[in-house]
Every structure is written in structure tokens, then in C-alpha cells.
């Protein structure tokens, strides 16, 4: 194995669960966001693949309430508005990293957990399986 | 005020640091992420508005490997393959929390992050500005 | 510079339904960044929540408790307001009025911008 | 709902003195979702902190927050005249779950 040197400065972790279980300063630091990413919010109704947000709520998570996108259409939107069902509205989904207590009630100690999201809808063309 | 006892079995706090400070367990728990994410990464290839993977990564953060999409036409895909500049192909962002190792090198010290993040793209109808 | 303009009357009678607007100027009453809020001060209750309208894709309503069978918040995107309706008003009800707007990131939950306040008085 | 408890109820400190308010919620809440106002006579509520330990736009650093869990505490490093007023933290714990202490007055003594 690789042999890192222990920085003079860094937390100990002479603990049992190392490296499971770290120190995490909660006080989040806002990385390339100066854009307010809800800018992007109105392409749920102009998309061609449109889609509604559906607030997932749970107060034991942090963020307690995720949006979550579902395609409006099996479909996709034609310029005359109407629905083409040779194209496929599909989600684009993400894995995020959520935190939740654990143990539960215990105010400090925390487990990371990744969920899978849906962020919007996009065109696809479809697979299409030919039988033999 | 309100006597609230502290929980047996939660981690001791007396840290200097403390309350900004947690424990966190990295032994992630997958919350209904059994179908693998990249499942859906044909998407970017049969989109209309298909997109390019470029890999983001930081070893001094987790997930140290962001996929990072970027659109690959200003305007969207048309049946025949031709690109249609009368709508547009937008990127979907998400804000995602991330850990930053914090003092930089330290291996069981992090930092929450947010970060801005481009999951796919769409086909949006553009905002026509009617000049007077 | 976002500002809250709250208008009304300040006497209503018992059993009446209290109407109270609040216009919005430097944001908009549909922003997906944004809840718009109601917010009451007493002597008695001190702060207390009563509701919210945010917009993401459709309009959501978050109705306090204590409230929840008497009060309607509706938004008017075309004057860019939203209003407090309460029903059935009884003297508790008499407080100072605040609209407010809620930063919602997920991340975030804040009041950062206030209405500057209607005192009202439920009395016959 | 959760009750977030206030104290001391009144403190009475001279100019240029250290003010430490505390927050106690009935169950743990986010941090992430803990404000603190202040609130001078015939005024709306003003954001100081939010996040648990984020200044607002505009506020002087001499204004700080911390806390996890249940305990939350403002601190005010070295009192101005400005800022004897009453001061209330605010909690979100979900959607229908939003509440505020009973607020702390800062006095002149």
C-alpha cells in the first residue's frame, strides 16, 4: 500500500471506524453558483420533453424537500404543440448526496447517503427492436 | 427552557469546533439507487438535444469524479440529423452538495460544498424579444 | 432592490374575512427560488407563521396548522402580488401582518425580505 | 410542532459588551435551516443569520451564529447602540413546520 504522511495540522483519527466516519464542517461553501441555477427553472414548459416538479419531503434528510422532474409525456412536443409518440420524453436522473442523522435524534453525527434524482426530461429517438 | 436529554450512544461533541464540526459515516447507504445511474447514458447520444460527457475531476473532493455535461449544438436535432437552430439545446443544472477535504491533503477532514452541475441537455422553444 | 408592498384595511369585524395584498417589486411572484409568505405578530402568539405560496411548474400552498381551515394565499401573476385571505376572524386574530419572502433553496430556509407591517384590529 | 425556547427572555448589557442568546428547539433540527432576526419598535424582523452561522447580506461581523442539533446560540462580540433590540430565531423543519421563539430583548443597562 501507498504510504501517506500524516499532515501536522489535520484532525486526529486515531478511531476505531476510520476512516468510515470523518469530521465535515457543515458550514457550506458555495462553489461557481453566482448564477442562480434556478434560471434553467422555466425549461420544464418550454423543453419539447416537458416535465412537473413533485416535491419529495422528508424532514429527516438534508435538503428535507428534493424536486423531483417527471416527463409530462411518453412522447415529445411538436412545434404545432402537439405530442409525437415516435420520439420518447425520458428523465435525466442524477445521483445525489443527501445527509441523514444516524443515529436517528442524535444532533451531530450524520451518515451520507446518495439517492437517485430526476433533474428534467429530455427527446430521445427510441430503441426500436426488430423481431426476426 | 425545555430539558432535553442527551441521547446515549450519540458521539461526544467537545470539540472546539463543535457544532460546526459533525461526524459523518462515509459508508454510503444507496437509497433506491439499485438501476445504475449510467443506465441512462445512451440518453446523450439518441437526444435531440444530445450532449458530451467531459469528466470533472478533484481528488480533494467527494465525489472526486463529476460527469460534467455539455451540450453539443446550440440548436436541436431534426429527424433527418440536421440541426434545427429555431429551437435550442439548454443544459439542465442541478445544485449537488459535495465533500471538500479541508485543510487540503487531510484525509478524515471535509467540508460540505455545493456545486453547480450540468446533468444533460434539452430541447427548449427559444424566448423570442420582439424589439418595438 | 426587492420590496414588499402591503396594503388593506386595518379594522375588520368579527366573523368577517380579513383581505390583506402584498406587491411584489425586483422579483416575481412565480420565482422558482422563492416562497412568498404570510406572517403574524402578537402581543399574545409573538411570531407566527401562517402560510406560503412558491411556484415550481404548478402553484403549491403550505398552510400552517393553526389556520388551515380558514386561510386562502393566492398569487396574481399579472400584478405580480399575492394576498392573504382569512375567514371567520375573532379578536385572537388581531396582529401586526407581515408579508415576507422565503429564500428556498433546499439548502436554505429564510425570511430575507419583509412587507413593512399592517396592524389588524378584529372589533365590532 | 416545535417549540424553540429563548433565553434569557430580557438581557441587559452596556455598550461594548459581549450579548450571547440561546435557542433551544424541543427535537433536533437542521442547522441549515435556523435563522436569526432582530427587531427594533414599529419595524418588520431584519435577517442577521441564516444557516445556523451565515451573516446576511449587509450585517456587521461582530454579529455570529452557531449550534447543531437542539442548542443554537447568537452572539453579539461587542454591543453599538444599534443593535439593543429583540432578537428571534427561526426554525423550518418542513414544509407545514415553521416556527419562531419567543424572542430575547437586549437592553441598555
Known amino acids: 500500500g501507498i504510504a501517506i504522511p500524516r499532515n501536522s495540522g489535520c484532525p486526529n483519527s486515531e478511531d476505531k471506524n476510520f476512516p468510515r466516519t470523518v469530521m465535515v464542517n457543515l458550514n457550506i461553501h458555495n462553489r461557481n453558483t453566482s448564477t442562480n441555477p434556478k434560471r434553467s427553472s422555466d425549461y420544464y414548459n418550454r423543453s419539447t420533453s416537458p416535465w412537473n416538479l413533485h416535491r419529495n419531503e422528508d424532514p429527516e434528510r438534508y435538503p428535507s424537500v428534493i424536486w423531483e422532474a417527471k416527463c409530462r409525456h411518453l412522447g415529445c412536443v411538436k412545434a404545432d404543440g402537439n405530442v409525437d409518440y415516435h420520439m420518447n420524453s425520458v428523465p435525466i436522473q442524477q445521483e445525489i448526496l443527501v445527509l441523514r442523522r444516524e443515529p436517528r435524534h442524535c444532533p451531530n453525527s450524520f451518515r451520507l447517503e446518495k439517492i437517485l434524482v430526476s433533474v428534467g426530461c429530455t427527446c430521445v429517438t427510441p430503441i426500436v427492436h426488430h423481431v426476426a | 427552557g425545555i430539558a432535553i436529554p442527551r441521547n446515549s450512544g450519540c458521539p461526544n461533541s467537545e470539540d472546539k469546533n463543535f457544532p460546526r464540526t459533525v461526524m459523518v459515516n462515509l459508508n454510503i447507504h444507496n437509497r433506491n439507487t439499485s438501476t445504475n445511474p449510467k443506465r441512462s447514458s445512451d440518453y446523450y447520444n439518441r437526444s435531440t438535444s444530445p450532449w458530451n460527457l467531459h469528466r470533472n475531476e478533484d481528488p480533494e473532493r467527494y465525489p472526486s469524479v463529476i460527469w460534467e455535461a455539455k451540450c453539443r449544438h446550440l440548436g436541436c436535432v431534426k429527424a433527418d440529423g440536421n440541426v434545427d437552430y429555431h429551437m435550442n439545446s439548454v443544459p439542465i443544472q442541478q445544485e449537488i452538495l459535495v465533500l471538500r477535504r479541508e485543510p487540503r491533503h487531510c484525509p478524515n477532514s471535509f467540508r460540505l460544498e455545493k456545486i453547480l452541475v450540468s446533468v444533460g441537455c434539452t430541447c427548449v422553444t427559444p424566448i423570442v424579444h420582439h424589439v418595438a | 432592490q426587492v420590496q414588499l408592498q402591503q396594503s388593506g384595511p386595518g379594522l375588520v369585524k368579527p366573523s368577517q374575512t380579513l383581505s390583506l395584498t402584498c406587491a411584489i417589486s425586483g422579483d416575481s411572484v412565480s420565482s422558482s427560488s422563492a416562497a412568498w409568505g404570510w406572517i403574524r405578530q402578537s402581543p399574545s402568539r409573538g411570531l407566527e407563521w401562517l402560510g406560503r405560496?412558491?411556484?415550481?411548474?404548478?402553484?403549491?400552498?403550505d398552510y400552517a396548522v393553526s389556520v388551515k381551515s380558514r386561510i386562502t394565499i393566492n398569487p396574481d401573476t399579472s400584478k405580480n402580488q399575492f394576498s392573504l385571505q382569512l375567514n371567520s376572524v375573532t379578536p385572537e386574530d388581531t396582529a401586526v401582518y407581515y408579508c415576507a419572502r422565503e429564500v428556498d433553496s433546499i439548502y436554505y430556509s429564510y425570511f430575507d425580505i419583509w412587507g413593512q407591517g399592517t396592524l389588524v384590529t378584529v372589533s365590532s | 410542532e416545535i417549540v424553540l425556547t429563548q433565553s434569557p427572555a430580557t438581557l441587559s448589557l452596556s455598550p461594548g459588551e459581549r450579548a450571547t442568546l440561546s435557542c433551544r428547539a424541543s427535537?433536533?433540527?437542521?442547522?441549515?435551516?435556523l435563522a436569526w432576526y432582530q427587531q427594533k419598535p414599529g419595524q418588520a424582523p431584519r435577517l442577521l443569520i441564516y444557516g445556523a452561522s451565515n451573516r446576511a447580506t449587509g450585517i456587521p461581523a461582530r454579529f455570529s451564529g452557531s449550534g447543531s442539533g437542539t442548542d443554537f446560540t447568537l452572539t453579539i462580540s461587542s454591543l453599538e447602540p444599534e443593535d439593543f433590540a429583540v432578537y428571534y430565531c427561526q426554525q423550518y423543519r418542513s414544509t407545514l413546520s415553521l416556527t419562531f421563539g419567543q424572542g430575547t430583548k437586549v437592553e441598555i443597562k
Open positions: 405560496i412558491s411556484y415550481r411548474s404548478k402553484w403549491y400552498n
Open positions: 427535537q433536533n433540527v437542521w442547522a441549515f435551516y
